[in-house]
């Protein structure tokens, strides 16, 4: 067996079992679980005389380790005296010593409850610069207690003079506060409040909680996009399972149809997320006619960690239909960005909310990554609206200054599409009737000022431009207008855009 240091326990009688007139009393110290022999036990009896006797070591049968007991008999004024049993085990190390200090007898006592509370996060859910830990030691029979704070098991140098004790009836409570810097708290260390009372140790520990508390697994089932349904004519639906914890269990996604007819072969993809979760998607091709005729599709998700299967179903949206209105705009040139322009497309008052937005240039559809389109939002009425934004380059508009914003929606006729063309420089592209109208003059400034119209997307014309006020009931819907630079001595230039 390898070297093992002893565990040391005080041996005392219950105070109520010692006669009040007893002139001498015996207490003991048990050293157990050590190897090899020997241990040396000495006693500190203070001012009292005492006789000691150390019993021969016995072997613990299971482990082969040793145990021994040392007894101390004292006489005189022992009731108020504390005694220290000192156990040394030189085989463990030359300076290995364990001290136990205790009184002759143990009283019946109610042990304390130890609980650490921590200060709250700020309103935004972030940790403040300092974190307070409060150790509540409550409900114990009044007596001496020692509080020690540990950081990852190491004793901390803490001012304990702030600890306060109160008595409630026959029981007492004490509290001690520890203030930590945010850096220490976020370092993932464990903080322990250790309480020593009547020769016993009680403790509670805490640490910063994991960044992402485990959430329940969620499943979502999407409808086919109108573009896939009406233009590509190869619609798919996707079952998405999120917030799966890392596990050895397999996620099964099973497809079915309410009609009981067979489903096509699905494709599956698994992706790891930086927040430590797994996302699983299964994409199922569906028949265009089946979907339009109202077939319902179901996705069933099973996983060993789920208490029961998750079921999700999808079908064509019911309710009233309304075709989208499409409006396309070009923002003006912005100082420092002469070779780039932003085009905006407002699509509104459509029902249901399923819509696909595309941009085309030179009769070619631009990749989806080129534009950014909002999720459908409800209008004040019963329909929905979206905005789509496309950045174009000078090379593109000089090649052909016409860009098309196209909405694909089931209520649009005749071919489920509505589109609008927009030019970066409509005034230079043949001069529309709009650009010939003499506008009402209102000065536009580069900063937004009260009472002045503001260009869509937060941009405004050149600071030295006059702008048409648009409609008299401004701010009404934005309108296209002409701006003429008023700088004298320079060739005037026109700008057509939004004010």
């Amino acid at each position: 067996a390898s070297t093992q240091s002893p565990s040391v326990f005080p041996l005392t009688r219950c105070c109520k079992n010692i006669p009040s007139n007893a002139t001498s009393v015996t207490l003991g110290c048990l050293a157990t679980g050590y190897f090899p022999e020997p241990v040396m036990v000495t006693w500190d009896t203070g001012s009292l005389n005492g006789t000691t006797m150390t019993l021969p070591a016995t072997t613990l049968t299971l482990s082969g380790h040793y145990a021994t007991i040392s007894l101390l008999t004292v006489s005189g004024a022992w009731a108020k005296q504390m005694f220290t049993c000192r156990v040394a085990h030189t085989p463990s190390s030359t300076d290995w010593v364990d001290n136990k200090t205790f009184s002759v007898c143990s009283r019946d006592f109610t042990p304390p409850t130890v609980k650490i509370l921590q200060s709250s996060c700020d309103g935004g859910g972030h940790f403040p610069p300092t974190i307070q830990l409060l150790c509540l030691v409550s409900g114990y029979t009044p007596g001496t207690i020692n509080i020690t704070w540990l950081e990852d098991g190491q004793v901390m140098d803490v001012d304990l003079s702030t600890a306060s004790t109160t008595q409630e009836g026959e029981l007492a409570s004490t509290q001690s506060e520890l203030t930590l810097s945010q850096k220490h708290w976020l370092s993932d260390r464990t903080y322990t409040c250790q309480v020593t009372y009547q020769g016993h140790t009680f403790e509670d520990s805490t640490k910063k909680c994991a960044d992402s508390n485990p959430r329940g697994v969620s499943a979502y089932l999407s409808r086919p996009s109108p573009f896939d349904l009406f233009i590509r004519k190869s619609p798919t639906i996707t079952c998405l399972v999120v917030d799966l914890a890392p596990s050895k269990g397999t996620v099964n996604l099973t497809w079915s149809r309410a009609s009981g007819k067979p489903v096509n072969h699905s494709t599956r993809k698994e992706e790891k997320q930086r927040n430590g979760t797994l996302t699983v998607t299964s994409t199922l091709p569906v028949g265009t006619r089946d979907w339009i005729e109202g077939e319902t599709y179901q996705c069933r998700v099973t996983h060993p960690h789920l208490p029961r299967a998750l079921m999700r179903s999808t079908t064509k949206t019911s309710g009233p239909r309304a075709a989208p209105e499409v409006y396309a705009f070009a923002t003006p040139e912005w100082p420092g960005s002469r070779d780039k322009r932003t085009l905006a497309c407002l699509i509104q008052n459509f029902m249901p909310e399923d819509i696909s937005v595309q941009w085309l240039h030179n009769e070619v559809q631009l990749p989806d990554a080129r534009h950014s389109t909002t999720q459908p939002r409800k209008t004040k009425g019963s329909g929905f609206f979206v905005f789509s934004r496309l950045e174009v380059t000078r090379a593109e508009w000089e090649q052909k200054d016409e860009f098309i914003c196209r909405a694909v929606h089931e209520a649009a006729s005749p071919s489920q599409t509505v589109q609008r063309a927009v030019s970066v420089n409509p005034g230079l592209a043949g001069g529309s009737a709009q650009s010939q109208r003499a506008p009402d003059r209102v000065l536009c400034h580069s900063g937004q000022q009260q009472g002045l119209p503001r260009a869509a997307g937060g941009s405004v014309p050149h600071p030295r431009c006059h702008c048409g006020a648009g409609r008299a009931d401004w701010p009404g819907p934005p309108e296209l207008d002409v701006c003429v630079e008023e700088a004298e001595g320079e060739a005037p230039w026109t700008w057509t855009g939004l004010c």
């Epitope: 914890a245 698994e270 930086r274 430590g276």
Partner: antibody, heavy 114, light 110 residues
Amino acid sequence: SLEESGGRLVTPGTPLTLTCTASGFSLSSYHMSWVRQAPGKGLEWIGVINSAGNTYYASWAKGRFTVSKTSTTVDLNLTSLTTEDTATYFCARYVFSSGSHDIWGPGTLVTVSS
Amino acid sequence: AYDMTQTPASVEVAVGGTVTIKCQASQSIGSWLAWYQQKPGQPPKELIYGTSTLESGVPSRFIGSGSGTEFTLTISGVECADAATYYCQQGYSEDNIDNAFGGGTEVVVK
């Protein structure tokens, strides 16, 4: 279980193919990794082939090592071998949903020496 | 690149003691971290996956913790059988990496 084979003593520049034979599970359901360990050194990830047959390699292994598979075996092709490639080569089953390797073969030793 | 740095390279611990091994990722890997134990002449054995989930049959004295870029393996109540080399491995990305494994920590039990 997994068992590697094909390890032997070769001279620098000699190409070599190591084979990992799987039993008890289907390679079509799991990713498979190759990992090597030079004598007295740590584990070095070479590459992985996923259930669909797509491959990913450590940046240092691209171009010199190729992973491929059949229904029951996974191969590691080693080209332009140098003495630095002397190592025990392990194949391991990679569970994508846990991000870990749960079954390992005993390894096969490749010694490159002139 | 997702590179793993493991410390210390070697540690000595007494039977019954506690040993702590740290693993640092060069960028966040969430909780996609596994720990392995390898004894001489044997292949590695999986201990922990998902930062803290014990593989079946692994004693509860092995504890994994951490998230993001900082991870820890703690072995408490060390036994002679725990003498081995321990490796961490990131399981977040299979792409753009030099080595999925940390350099290893040799645990010597006295």
